[in-house]
Interface confidence: low
């Protein structure tokens, strides 16, 4: 009898440990993706940035997928999303096409099931980068809490991609799961 | 027999409650440190800010350590790090050394075991603070998700420290643990 | 005997599932509120923004309350608070009252028990939006980790409310609970 009870207890403990471990690990997907500067588009128009590192330096990913320039959600949940985008120009890089710039970032969500794309967050500034100064810099940070479903994709669009700062500490975006959907 | 079972059940419940409480509390270190304006360096060069409050007003710390101007990680994990840095100048403070400013923040990680320091996040802007306006203000916010190991140290570097806004709601940085390292 | 043990085990499992579910759901209140542009105050002075959506588009709320323009905490805990505020102006909207602007956000906490209001976070910039450019834009992002008690209220104040960008991806604020108070 006592042996049987212990076996039952072990099952209770075991299943709980499994459940706890599983829910803890599976419930917390994350990604921190840093710009891959080998493939930054040129020009000043608004473009989707498709080249990001996911496995070098500060970049990392777990229980999410990076494919075709998009961060793919593998698990339903509420996530905190963030992006930090830095723009810079040094006069030794040549003249700017215009001194009046619109430096912007858009964090978008694409749903494959119902083909549609929506902007979750945007940020930026209009800037006057005059020739009187030899160096210009500007950073944007956005962040917010969103419900994401498995299969949905997160991507980053920016204006003036040729001005992006290619450092891993400068231009990045990411997500981490905070809680399940009830 | 039934009494024995209840004792076993109590053990199961008890150990689980302990485990749950312990893992929950220990798994979530955090800190929110606010600028200590009594000791802000002067000048316009890039400096490491070493004076922060950890136990007054909005400032708080738990399961992390603040020492020698650095936030020390006591527990391996993935953390969300953030910083908000405000710069300001009023004409009553006297003329600026230059109207062209580079207002920047760098969030750095130092590893003691392998002596090295790396920038995790940076942000900021070049600004033209002309004498035509009596008051100037600018804030930077950065945030990101990073793997931190016990013993690693987080510190904040800024340019133009003499222009920092000394309010606790203006200039601060922090971290909170989101999940364990698998 | 064995049947009794199974009943006990079911109780153990059942109570644990209840406890786990309850603590998990209850421990994680959140809100993401987006600007309700139908009721943005005019003028350039500093005002409290009282109209926010909580249940349409990206806006959502759980285990927190939105009332009288304030986000009310229903559960003690440590929360990550954030806000993204976008300002914009197009020359077709008419001339600005002044080209020198102070574009600011203040995230405030009000305690009802001890009637008092305190700024938790602030951010922004002074801007020179000259008539030489037809369009101007600027975004502010702030975020931080704060201890909040049940009944406390979070609100957003901005300067120059008439310049707010009314899009849900542009002007929003939110909170999510990270951990209990020990």
């Amino acid at each position: 009898g006592s042996q049987h009870i212990r076996a039952e207890k072990a099952m209770v403990d075991g299943s709980w440990l499994d459940l706890a471990k599983r829910s803890k690990l599976e419930a917390q997907p994350f990604a921190h993706l840093t710009i891959n500067a080998t493939d930054i588009p040129s020009g000043s128009h608004k473009v989707s940035l498709s080249s990001w590192y996911h496995d070098r330096g500060w970049a990392k990913i777990s229980n999410m997928t990076f494919s075709n320039g998009k961060l793919i959600v593998n698990q339903d949940g509420f996530y905190y999303l963030y992006a930090n985008i830095c723009f810079r120009h040094h006069e030794t890089s040549g003249d700017l096409a215009t001194e009046y710039l619109q430096l912007m970032v858009y964090v978008t969500k694409t749903s494959i099931k119902i083909p549609s794309s929506h902007t979750l967050m945007k940020g930026g500034s209009t800037k006057y980068w005059s020739g009187n100064s030899e160096f210009h810099f500007y950073s944007i940070n956005v962040g917010g809490f969103f419900k994401l479903r498995s299969g949905e994709e997160i991507s980053i669009e920016v204006s003036n991609p040729s001005l992006l700062d290619p450092d891993q500490d400068a231009t990045y975006f990411g997500a981490f799961k905070v809680r399940d959907i009830d | 027999g039934s009494q024995h079972i209840r004792a076993e059940k109590a053990m199961v419940d008890g150990s689980w409650l302990d485990l749950a409480k312990r893992s929950k509390l220990e798994a979530q270190p955090f800190a929110h440190l606010t600028i200590n304006a009594t000791d802000i360096p002067s000048g316009s060069h890039k400096v490491s800010l070493s004076s922060w409050y950890h136990d007054r007003g909005w400032a708080k710390i738990s399961n992390m350590t603040f020492s020698n101007g650095k936030l020390i990680v006591n527990q391996d994990g993935f953390y969300y790090l953030y910083a908000n840095i405000c710069f300001r100048h009023h004409e009553t403070s006297g003329d600026l050394a230059t109207e062209y400013l580079q207002l920047m923040v760098y969030v750095t990680k130092t590893s003691i075991k392998i002596p090295s320091s790396h920038t995790l996040m940076k942000g900021g802007s070049t600004k033209y603070w002309s004498g035509n306006s009596e008051f100037h203000f600018y804030s930077i916010n950065v945030g990101g998700f990073f793997k931190l190991r016990s013993g690693e140290e987080i510190s904040i570097e800024v340019s133009n420290p003499s222009l920092l806004d000394p309010d606790q709601d203006a200039t601060y940085f922090g971290a909170f643990k989101v999940r364990d390292i698998d | 005997g064995s049947q009794h043990i199974r009943a006990e085990k079911a109780m153990v499992d059942g109570s644990w599932l209840d406890l786990a579910k309850r603590s998990k759901l209850e421990a994680q209140p959140f809100a993401h509120l987006t600007i309700n542009a139908t009721d943005i105050p005019s003028g350039s002075h500093k005002v409290s923004l009282s109209s926010w959506y909580h249940d349409r588009g990206w806006a959502k709320i759980s285990n927190m309350t939105f009332s009288n323009g304030k986000l009310i905490v229903n559960q003690d805990g440590f929360y990550y608070l954030y806000a993204n505020i976008c300002f914009r102006h197009h020359e077709t909207s008419g001339d600005l009252a002044t080209e020198y602007l102070q574009l600011m956000v203040y995230v405030t906490k009000t305690s009802i028990k001890i009637p008092s209001s305190h700024t938790l976070m602030k951010g922004g910039s002074t801007k020179y939006w000259s008539g030489n450019s037809e369009f101007h834009f600027y975004s502010i992002n702030v975020g931080g980790f704060f201890k909040l008690r049940s009944g406390e209220e979070i609100s957003i104040e901005v300067s120059n409310p008439s310049l707010l960008d009314p899009d849900q991806d542009a002007t929003y604020f939110g909170a999510f609970k990270v951990r209990d108070i020990d």
Partner: antibody, heavy 115, light 107 residues
Framework: EVQLVQSGGGLVHPGGSLRLSCVGS????????MHWVRQAPGKGLEWVSG???????NYADSVKGRFTISRDTAKNSLYLQMNSLRAEDMAVYYC?????????WGQGTLVTVSS | DIQMTQSPSSLSASVGDRVTITCRAS??????LAWYQQKPEKAPKSLIY???SLQSGVPSRFSGSGSGTDFTLTISSLQPEDFATYYC?????????FGQGTKVEIK
């Protein structure tokens, strides 16, 4: 056509000093960043220092603390003050205009460091 | 510092040949790359900036391409006056750095 004319090279002993000059003409000198680039005998090109139109300066690590770049916009002139010269500083030094890469170069001046 | 690596370090070619020189950056530099030509005892001459933009007065037989880390200088039909040493240079970040050079000799 943009012109950059250099002067000031010569023989100097290790530890000695030398000042190089570069005069620009047929362009708005004050509006352009300017640089010094050197080439050791039989070797490739090495950037030494740059100065922006706003006066900001940059130096290669190998010369930091020993060389000083400056400009006099009234005279359309660029200078490189070289102190504590070493054998490894021996090279032909070129001044170059620095917008859209180094688009125009001076004729070069030889600096010989020998005891 | 960003390292620039050119290949080949030298090549022999005949007048009329199509010549290609490659340059690789140790990290991404977007299109902040220039190419220079240098003849013995002369100052370098700018050929291309921003990876593919031809400097004014440079013959159209010279062209540049690439973005990120891999770049190419092409001379579509080699002329007698093109025998020289060619350098690539990045100006994405300080300090500006040059490749070690590629010497184009007569076959």
């Amino acid at each position: 056509e943009v012109q950059l004319v250099q002067s000031g090279g010569g023989l100097v002993h290790p530890g000695g000093s030398l000042r190089l000059s570069c005069v620009g003409s047929r362009f708005t000198f004050s509006a352009y960043p300017m640089h010094w680039v050197r080439q050791a005998p039989g070797k490739g090109l090495e950037w030494v220092s740059g100065i922006g139109s706003g006066g900001g300066t940059n130096y290669a690590d190998s010369v930091k603390g020993r060389f000083t770049i400056s400009r006099d916009t009234a005279k359309n002139s660029l200078y490189l003050q070289m102190n504590s010269l070493r054998a490894e500083d021996m090279a032909v030094y070129y001044c170059a205009r620095g917008r859209n890469s180094f688009d125009y170069w001076g004729q070069g001046t030889l600096v010989t460091v020998s005891s | 510092d960003i390292q620039m690596t050119q290949s080949p370090s030298s090549l022999s070619a005949s007048v009329g040949d199509r010549v290609t020189i490659t340059c690789r950056a140790s990290q991404g530099i977007s299109t902040w790359l220039a190419w220079y030509q240098q003849k013995p005892e002369k100052a370098p001459k700018s050929l291309i900036y921003a990876a593919s933009s031809l400097q004014s007065g440079v013959p159209s037989r010279f062209s540049g391409s690439g973005s990120g880390t891999d770049f190419t200088l092409t001379i579509s039909s080699l002329q007698p006056e093109d025998f020289a040493t060619y350098y690539c240079q990045q100006y994405n970040s300080y300090p500006p750095t040059f490749g070690q050079g590629t010497k184009v000799e007569i076959k």
